[in-house]
């Protein structure tokens, strides 16, 4: 369907002389210009009532006829004024002008809401010429309009670097309620109030909003958009929409779902992902939020030897990145870890236990009684120690790292040896005569190397010397035993 | 909704602003306009403020009233009071951008110009 | 700008029957014209506009026509609640012409 949109006032002669024939639609035009290339033509209405062009933007031309008589001021004449149409409805209208034959390139471009329209608009330029005058008549149409299409159309006329404007032409789509703002899914807390909104527009208006709940509405009366719904409070999920009216008809929102925040769910598939002497690195999946962020979580230990006194280790951490390294724990020892998070509600239950393992330690004491002494016939020097009392944890001694140090005339030279766990002394050569050997022995388990016993030191003389007393590890307090010989 | 404020007494000269406060719709999407309406008289349109905030007048308006917009708000001024500017003052919601007929209007506020 | 003349300024009819208010325009508007009904004491009420489209909630006994400079407005199956002072407006490229209107036409029921 289309509406057409007739031109209330036909071409009336602006001009002093015969204006033959008025405008009807079985006229052809004689020259007939399409606005843009390539648009299909739009029909042409005829002008049913007689009128007189308006007063509003003219352009008094400065040129004279034949009889030197002064043109007239230009104006477009009288448009429809307001055109009320549905939306996917066709639409033409037009604007219509009357210029003396002396003015050759008359343009007359079409305007929306203060910008031109350019492209892909169906408009159409259309000449009646005359003796004297030229009746122009542009006209414009929209095949299926929008609500994009409302608003105010004018025409302009560039003539002789005037410009002539025609009063406006509004364009009223009217159509089903259009939603602005509609409700949002929300999470709230249980008993609490809390407001949705609904706004719809015209044209037409005004837009009238009903609520529904759960397929039922909620206000017998409808509200004036747009509406704020206040629930007191809910105690279960529930869906949320709200229906604008119009006197075009009826548009629903979207569905909402309002849902009752809880405490989350516990996490699940704790797993280790690394683990040492003393920390374990720990992962989990976390488990329904309850309609609340997660804030953070409780990584709870407890030592699963059926010994211990049972008590629980807490550490607490962020609820992301889902992952934590449990610090300060025992080497090669057993525990049960379980996590649980929480929101603004509560705590989550604890995950499932799982059971985790340290490995083992490196040795926590170092070789005790460490005794050097100088064998100078074979040019060795002994070392003797006691074994450290070794934990269980610290696992099973694989052996020794012995660190002999030479120092001679600001030279400096550190060797390491290693020793197998049986025995407990070893001998190396004299690197060097005349300087300071220092050692240092410390245990060696799988889980690593222990710390090193106090430094001894011997001075190896030159050679010629005799057998010299035994350096041992110093008593406490005395820090750097040297065998003065 | 359209509600108007700020209509009082005063004395010829003063210079009065009044507000139209708008809600539900935006004024970047309407027009507003303003009419008066004297003691036991008719409608008489002052202007129109359209969505872009360009200002049309009645012919007898022009110089007397100023019409302006914020966000939420529209005022009309007027610049020089005179008694006969003694009426109840309507702002009104356009039916576009710029479209002058006016479907929703507010209660109305009266202005009393006396010396 | 365009000058809106209303008649008659008053008007009896008794309940039940029609009344037609009559709004001339010193220059051809199209059809951009509003009717608005208005109260004692109470803010105008949109009727019609583009001179013959009913606003929303306005009974069907309300009707508009004309285009060009003359206009009506008919109440048919006149109510007591219709009784009230109706408004002509022009409202035709408002930019140039202004937005006037009519004096005014009160209805009186019987």
């Known amino acids: 369907a289309i509406t057409e949109a007739r031109e209330e006032a036909k071409p009336y002669p602006l001009f002093p002389g015969p204006f033959p024939g008025s405008l009807q639609t079985d006229h052809t035009p004689l020259l007939s210009l399409p606005h843009a290339s390539g648009y299909q033509p739009a029909l042409m209405f005829s002008p049913t009532q007689p009128g007189r062009p308006h007063t509003g933007n003219v352009a008094i031309p400065q040129v004279t006829s034949v009889e030197s008589k002064p043109l007239p001021p230009l104006a477009f004449k009288h448009t429809v004024g307001h055109i009320i149409l549905s939306e996917h409805k066709g639409v033409k209208f037009n604007c219509s002008i009357s210029v003396p034959n002396i003015y050759q390139d008359t343009t007359i471009s079409w305007w929306k809401d203060g910008k031109e329209l350019l492209g892909a608009h169906h408009a159409i330029t259309q000449f009646y010429p005359d003796d004297e005058v030229t009746a122009i008549i542009a006209s414009f149409s929209i095949t299926s309009v929008q609500r994009s299409d409302n608003g105010s159309y004018i025409c302009k006329m560039k003539i002789n670097n005037e410009e002539i404007v025609s009063d406006p032409i509004y364009i009223e789509v009217q159509g089903l309620p259009h939603f602005t703002k509609q409700p949002e899914s929300m999470n709230v807390t249980r008993n609490t109030a809390f407001n949705l909104t609904c706004q719809a527009v015209g044209p037409p208006e005004p837009v009238n909003i009903f609520w529904v709940q759960n397929s039922s509405r909620v206000n017998e009366q409808p509200e004036k958009s747009p509406s704020v719904l206040t629930v007191p409070g809910l105690t279960e999920m529930a869906v949320f929409s709200c229906e604008a009216h119009n006197d075009k008809g009826l548009t629903v929102s979207k569905g909402v779902q309002i849902n009752i925040k809880a405490i989350p769910s516990p996490p699940t598939e704790v797993s280790i992902r690394n683990s040492t002497a003393h920390s374990i690195l720990i992962s989990w999946v976390p488990g329904f939020d309850g309609y609340s962020p997660f804030r953070n979580c409780s990584i709870q230990v407890k030592e699963a030897d059926p010994l211990s006194n049972g008590s629980v280790m807490i550490f607490n951490t962020s609820a992301l990145p889902h992952l934590y390294q449990i610090k300060q724990l025992q080497a090669l020892a057993n525990y049960s870890i379980g996590v649980s998070c929480m929101n603004e509600i509560g705590w989550s239950a604890v995950s499932p236990w799982i059971l985790a393992s340290t490995t083992e330690g490196a040795p926590s004491v170092a070789p005790l009684n460490v005794t050097v002494f100088l064998n100078e016939s074979s040019d060795n020097v002994d070392i003797r120690w006691m074994k450290p009392p070794t934990k269980q944890q610290d696992g099973e001694l694989v052996g020794y790292r012995i660190s002999h140090v030479w120092q001679s005339a600001g030279i400096s030279k550190e060797l390491l040896e290693e020793v197998g766990q049986n025995g407990s002394r070893a001998r190396i050569s004299v690197q060097v005569h005349n300087a300071t050997c220092t050692v240092r022995i410390a245990a060696v388990t799988r889980g690593g190397v222990g710390p090193f016993s106090d430094p001894v030191k011997i001075f190896i003389p030159a050679h010629g010397w005799v057998d010299y007393a035994p350096s041992s590890t110093p008593a406490p307090g005395n820090a750097d035993p040297v065998l003065i010989i | 909704s359209v509600e108007e404020s700020g209509g009082r007494l005063v004395t010829p000269g003063t210079p009065l602003t009044v507000t139209c406060t708008v809600s539900?719709?935006?004024?970047?999407?309407?027009?507003m306009g303003w009419v008066r309406q004297a003691p036991g008289k008719g409608l008489e349109y002052i202007g129109f403020?359209?969505?872009?905030?360009n200002t049309y007048y009645a012919s007898w308006a022009k110089g007397r009233f100023t019409i302006s917009k914020t966000s939420t708000t529209v005022d009309l001024k007027i610049t020089s009071p005179t008694t006969e500017d003694t009426a109840t003052y309507f702002c009104?919601?356009?039916?576009?951008?710029?479209?002058?007929?006016?479907?929703?209007w507010g209660p109305g506020t009266l202005v009393t110009v006396s010396l | 700008d365009v000058v809106m003349t209303q008649t008659p300024a008053s008007v009896e009819a008794a309940v039940g029957g029609t009344v037609t208010i009559k709004c001339q325009a010193s220059?051809?508007?199209?059809?951009?014209l509003a009717w608005y009904q208005q109260k004692p004491g109470q803010r105008p009420k949109l009727l019609i506009y583009?001179?013959?489209n009913l606003a929303s909630g306005v009974p069907s006994r309300f009707a508009g026509s004309g285009s060009g400079t003359q206009f009506t407005l008919t109440i048919s199956d006149l109510e007591c609640a219709d009784a009230a002072t109706y408004y002509c407006?022009?409202?035709?490229?408002?930019?140039?012409?202004?937005?006037?209107f009519g004096g005014g036409t009160e209805v009186v029921v019987k």
């Open positions: 009104a919601k356009g039916g576009g951008g710029d479209w002058g007929y006016f479907n929703i």
């Open positions: 539900g719709f935006s004024l970047s999407v309407y027009g």
């Open positions: 403020i359209n969505n872009v905030g």
């Open positions: 220059q051809s508007i199209g059809n951009a």
């Open positions: 583009a001179a013959s």
């Open positions: 407006q022009t409202y035709y490229a408002i930019n140039r012409y202004g937005g006037a």
